[in-house]
């Protein structure tokens, strides 16, 4: 006899895991056999779909490899033409392990600002997310939360934040890590320590110090007057974040000195000053102060000036009294830039015998100054026009510095030697006498205002000098 | 920071040359006099030779004057030392070092880390 | 040829003062010699400690100290420490003419007991 179709298995709900096979079974009595069709969420799922896999007369659908989009609810629908067409529903709940679809990724931030490692997961039931640093679970405090979404928001970051994260996506089936990502912490770069101002002696060695801070570690660079650090030596070391850098000076002239600590974040840099102030104390003092030592002199700028193996006056309020006096020399030379072929090697030899003034060794180490008649040569005779020159520029504040005031001499304030012979000395490249001056071109219109002294002539070369040095 | 790398040693025979390199960084190399010094293996300091910081004049110990050179190339920030006619009792370690000042003579306050200058056959 | 001449080795009691000596086998040092002293520990390079006859470099702790006594440049450690313990060297000018020379001592080996 014709029966109706009565469905005498209902559907149930499946739970299946993505990848595998999920089955539902409609089992059906009635005669004639009925027309078994499917439907996900109301809509009608086609025989030919290899995705599925009807048998028993359509009373077995078979999923075959469940995806997650898979969710939802299915019916079967049983008809033989006897009665009513008769239904049955079940749903699919696709159950998946966590899988994180959104891992976090390396970061750098600046210290200061809020940094959000994304950490989006996907699972059926919802996995819960966590986060580690390091090796151990990381503390949500008022700064340092875990998302909805899972991923992990840090306010006002800290270079303590910095480290190796990653997330953990947890549910019932089983867990999912990320890999590991680096926080890194980048802070501007800062001064710790400033250098400081010193006022200070010509000639004396000074460092400055300066310390700065940062990530990455800062380049600190020194300027001098605006410009880059032209001379000294630089020293820098650096140890646990924090560069120190020592620039070690000598003395010349007064000088604004500005370290400067920079890095780099990302294309953009950040940069911290300091300055310090060098001034010169007491310019005329070392000439006045008689504390020092004699010895043999062994630079070079006067090697072809003094007398061979001369015992010098080394003046101990230079903290370095022969580079002191060989700068003194050199600079000097330099600031008396035009000078003729007549007044060079004279000129020389003054400076030299001045600056390196001879030695009398004693219990008081005492220099000699030069000769009166032989500074006034040099000034009014062999570099008249110079040394006019060079006062006015004096006068008018022209000099880069006022080191040249210690390098030549006042001819009135020396002593002559006609008080004294053994308390001034000679220049010894100023061999001429009376006859050989005839020759030298008038440079004066003046008469010199003392009587140059009758020296013995001498055959070799009056004004060899070494041309490494010379004046122009 | 202040540096100086020496380079430029090795074995050499009797009667061979050698020249040694000194590079220098973190300070203003043509302000300051630069020395040569050795120490043979297991002796004490020998003075080479000196140079003041504008190359204008040179020094030498007596036992290597007309065989060894010193030159610098301040544009270079480098230092050398040509070797020639090299004896075994040149084996040592040949330092760089650094002047604290201009002139050639006086205390080194800089040294590299030395170059090892084996003379033998 | 003048030869520079130290005590072969010494040694001195950690807090302990010692001085170290530096003469000419020939004449005396003086001033002109511009004694400078420098130390060197083992498998390192040297390091000046004093220029100048008793100029101290910089960085040098102020236990170091030079001076000229008598006819021999001198070294004075005050107060000693386990880390001074190393070999020294003085060196000396010797200019004469245009002659110059720049000469070691052998160095002397210190020992902080």
């Known amino acids: 006899l014709p029966k109706a179709p009565v469905i005498t298995t209902p559907l149930e709900t499946v739970d299946a895991l993505v990848e595998e096979v999920a089955t539902f079974m409609c089992a059906v009595e009635s005669y004639p056999q009925p027309e078994i069709s499917w439907t996900r969420n109301k809509i009608l799922i086609k025989l030919f779909d290899t995705r599925y896999s009807i048998r028993e007369n359509g009373q077995l659908l078979t999923i075959l490899s469940v995806e997650d989009s898979d969710d939802g609810i299915y019916c079967c629908t049983a008809n033989n033409g006897v009665g009513g067409a008769v239904e049955s529903c079940g749903a699919l709940q696709v159950k998946m392990k966590p899988k994180i679809t959104r891992p976090p990724i390396n970061v750098k931030i600046i210290e200061g600002l809020k940094a959000v490692l994304p950490c989006t997961t996907m699972g059926n039931p919802k996995p819960s997310v966590s986060w580690i640093k390091g090796d151990s679970p990381l503390r949500e405090n008022s700064r340092i939360a875990v998302l909805e979404s899972g991923s992990l928001r840090i306010h006002n970051v800290q270079k303590e934040d910095a480290g190796q994260y990653r997330c953990v996506a947890k549910n019932s089936l089983g867990t999912a890590y990320s890999k590991v990502v680096k926080l890194e912490v980048e802070v501007f770069a800062r001064i710790l320590r400033a250098p400081e101002s010193h006022n200070v002696t010509f000639g004396s060695f000074v460092t400055l110090h300066c310390t700065a801070t940062g990530i990455p570690v800062p380049t600190i660079t020194w300027i001098e007057n605006g410009n880059a650090v032209s001379s000294g030596s630089i020293q820098e070391s650096v140890k646990d974040r924090v560069i120190d850098s020592r620039l070690q000076l000598f003395i010349t002239k007064p000088g604004l000195y500005t370290c400067i600590a920079t890095n780099k974040h990302g294309e953009k840099f950040s940069t911290a000053k300091a300055a310090a102030t060098i001034s010169i104390a007491e310019w005329s003092k070392p000439q006045k102060d008689n504390k020092g030592y004699c010895a043999q002199y062994r630079g070079e700028v006067c090697n072809a000036v003094l007398a061979k193996d001369a015992l010098v006056f080394l003046n101990t309020s230079y903290a370095d009294p022969e580079e002191a006096q060989e700068l003194l020399v050199h600079t000097a030379w330099n600031e008396l830039k035009v000078v003729s072929p007549v007044c060079r090697p004279a000129a020389e030899a003054l400076l030299c015998n001045h600056i390196f003034q001879e030695c009398s060794p004693g219990v008081v180490p005492t220099p000699i100054p030069i000769c009166r008649e032989y500074c006034l040569a040099v000034k009014e005779l062999f570099c008249a026009k110079e040394w006019l020159v060079m006062e006015e520029k004096t006068h008018r504040g022209l000099y880069r510095s006022e080191m040249h005031l210690l390098s030549v001499p006042e001819c009135s304030k020396l002593p002559s030697m006609h008080w004294d012979p053994t308390a001034c000395a000679r220049l010894p490249h100023l061999d001429y006498n009376k006859e050989n001056l005839k020759t030298f071109p008038p440079m004066t219109s003046s008469k010199p205002s003392v009587d140059i002294p009758n020296l013995p002539s001498s055959s070799s070369s009056s004004f060899s000098v070494s041309p490494t040095y010379s004046m122009t | 920071e202040l540096q100086l790398v020496e380079s430029g040693g090795g074995l050499v025979q009797p009667g061979g040359s050698l020249r040694l390199s000194c590079a220098a960084s973190?300070?203003?190399?043509?302000?300051?006099?630069m020395s040569w010094v050795r120490q043979a293996p297991g002796k004490g300091l020998e003075w080479v030779s000196a140079i003041p910081w504008n190359g204008g004049s040179t020094y030498y110990k007596e036992s290597v004057k007309g065989r060894f050179t010193i030159s610098r190339d301040n544009a270079k920030k480098t230092l050398y030392l040509q070797m020639n006619s090299l004896k075994s009792e040149d084996t040592a370690v040949y330092y760089c070092?650094?002047?604290?000042?201009?002139?050639?003579?006086?205390?080194?306050?800089?040294w590299g880390q030395g170059t090892l200058v084996t003379v033998s056959s | 040829q003048a030869v520079v001449t130290q005590e072969p080795s010494l040694s001195v009691s950690p807090g302990g003062t010692v001085t170290l000596t530096c003469g000419l086998s020939s004449g005396s040092v003086t001033s002109s010699n511009y004694p400078d002293w420098y130390q060197q520990t083992p498998g390192q390079a040297p390091r000046a400690l004093i220029y100048s006859t008793n100029s101290r470099h910089s960085g040098v702790p102020s236990r170091f100290s030079g001076s000229i006594s008598g006819n021999k440049a001198a070294l004075t450690i005050t107060g000693a420490q386990p880390e001074d313990e190393a070999d020294y060297y003085c060196a000396l000018y010797m200019g004469r003419g245009s002659n110059k020379d720049y000469v070691f001592g052998g160095g002397t080996k210190l020992t902080v007991l």
């Open positions: 070092a650094k002047r604290s000042g201009r002139i050639a003579f006086g205390a080194l306050d800089a």
């Open positions: 973190g300070f203003t190399f043509d302000d300051y006099g």
